[in-house]
Amino acid sequence: FERTRSLQDPCSNCPAGTFCDNNRNQICSPCPPNSFSSAGGQRTCDICRQCKGVFRTRKECSSTSNAECDCTPGFHCLGAGCSMCEQDCKQGQELTKKGCKDCCFGTFNDQKRGICRPWTNCSLDGKSVLVNGTKERDVVCGPSPADLSPGASSVTPPAPAREPGHSPQ
């Protein structure tokens, strides 16, 4: 069947980087500048992606593959194939509509992207808080109070003020 199809359809012989030109008796024509075809047998070439504004070119377009973009410094990629560039924030912050905001009490972000996450709930594993959390760092959990030797003590985190509803550590 494949062989029959290729005999009947001359376009199937057109390799990647070309298109089957109906205006020229279905001969294989090279893709025009700023276009590409990544597979054979195509009747048109696709327009190359242009990396403008906050996007910058990571890989140039060729006749057989699309351009690839990443983001200028201070921004990071989001979505499949870097479809969006999102502003970086500092550690201890997250991006909101108004820009970068400090993490709410009880949350942290140790990266320049993404959202603030809650501090680990040490008590879930029967442990206690060894080092308090900050905006930039998660709490450090230590042995459970029962495991501590006499005279040793663990740090108790401050009561969660301001933000309602953070679960107790």
Epitope: L78, E86, E94, L95, T96, K97, K98, K101, C104, G106, T107, G114, I115, C116, R117, P118, W119, T120, N121, L124, D138, E163, P164, G165, H166, S167
Partner: antibody, heavy 121, light 111 residues
Framework: EVQLVQSGAEVKKPGSSVKVSCKAS????????IYWVRQAPGQGLEWIGN????????FYGEKFMGRATFTADTSTSTAYMELSSLRSEDTAVYYC??????????????WGQGTLVTVSS | NVMLTQPHSVSESPGKTVTISCKLN????????VHWYQQRPGSSPTTMIY?????PDGVPDRFSGSIDSSSNSASLTISGLKTEDEADYYC??????????FGGGTKLTVL
């Protein structure tokens, strides 16, 4: 394909507890908040709280502090919400929902199908 | 407490345009994104507008969102109304990035 599949309907007596599950698939369970929202019959949406399954960190709405408990089992990618000391006013459809990790004030992009909890003596 | 207030119900004829408002009682409507969900009877909410004015894939361009800082409110506008648009619509924003807030919902009836 991202999916949140919740457990079936429950009928409970006042004073008892209910545990609703929300099984996630199609994404990295530990990297997104799971929110719990309820809707009483004929009423609007009400936030109960949320959990970060990556470390079990939780937040609760003031109205539900001490009565709601969220847990997450990362081995099965399942989040749980337990509500204790049930009363008739807790009769509602309970939803789990996922929030994207793009920004701190983002929308809920996927919702479970809802679990009807009826509290009746 | 931060509250989002929506009209309880709105109604309009097919083909017409309807606007549903969502007013913030305190703070600045521009501080956090506003999102809109559609909920048909017996179904879960689905996103119609996110981040103030963006439409998810598959949502018709008859749906649009906007923010009006002078009235401290957000709006969902549906043009070319169809009978299938009949549903409850909820706005959603934040009190803090931990605490989401929902409007009370608006029942849209297509006459």
């Amino acid at each position: 394909e991202v999916q949140l599949v919740q457990s079936g309907a429950e009928v409970k007596k006042p004073g008892s507890s209910v545990k609703v599950s929300c099984k996630a698939s199609g994404y990295t369970f530990t990297s997104y908040y799971i929110y719990w929202v309820r809707q009483a019959p004929g009423q609007g949406l009400e936030w109960i709280g949320n959990i970060w399954p990556g470390n079990g960190g939780t937040f609760y709405g003031e109205k539900f502090m001490g009565r709601a408990t969220f847990t997450a089992d990362t081995s099965t990618s399942t989040a749980y919400m337990e509500l204790s000391s049930l009363r008739s006013e807790d009769t509602a459809v309970y939803y789990c929902a996922r929030r994207p990790d793009y920004s701190g004030d983002d929308y809920f992009d996927y919702w479970g199908q809802g679990t009807l909890v009826t509290v009746s003596s | 407490n931060v509250m989002l207030t929506q009209p309880h119900s709105v109604s309009e004829s097919p083909g017409k345009t309807v606007t549903i408002s969502c007013k913030l009682n305190s703070g600045n409507i521009g501080s956090y994104y506003v999102h809109w969900y559609q909920q048909r009877p017996g179904s879960s909410p689905t996103t119609m507008i996110y981040r103030d004015d963006k439409r998810p894939d598959g949502v018709p361009d008859r749906f649009s969102g906007s923010i009006d800082s002078s009235s401290n409110s957000a709006s969902l506008t549906i043009s070319g109304l169809k009978t299938e648009d009949e549903a409850d619509y909820y706005c959603h924003s934040y009190d803090s990035t931990i605490t989401p807030v929902f409007g009370g919902g608006t029942k849209l009836t297509v006459l």
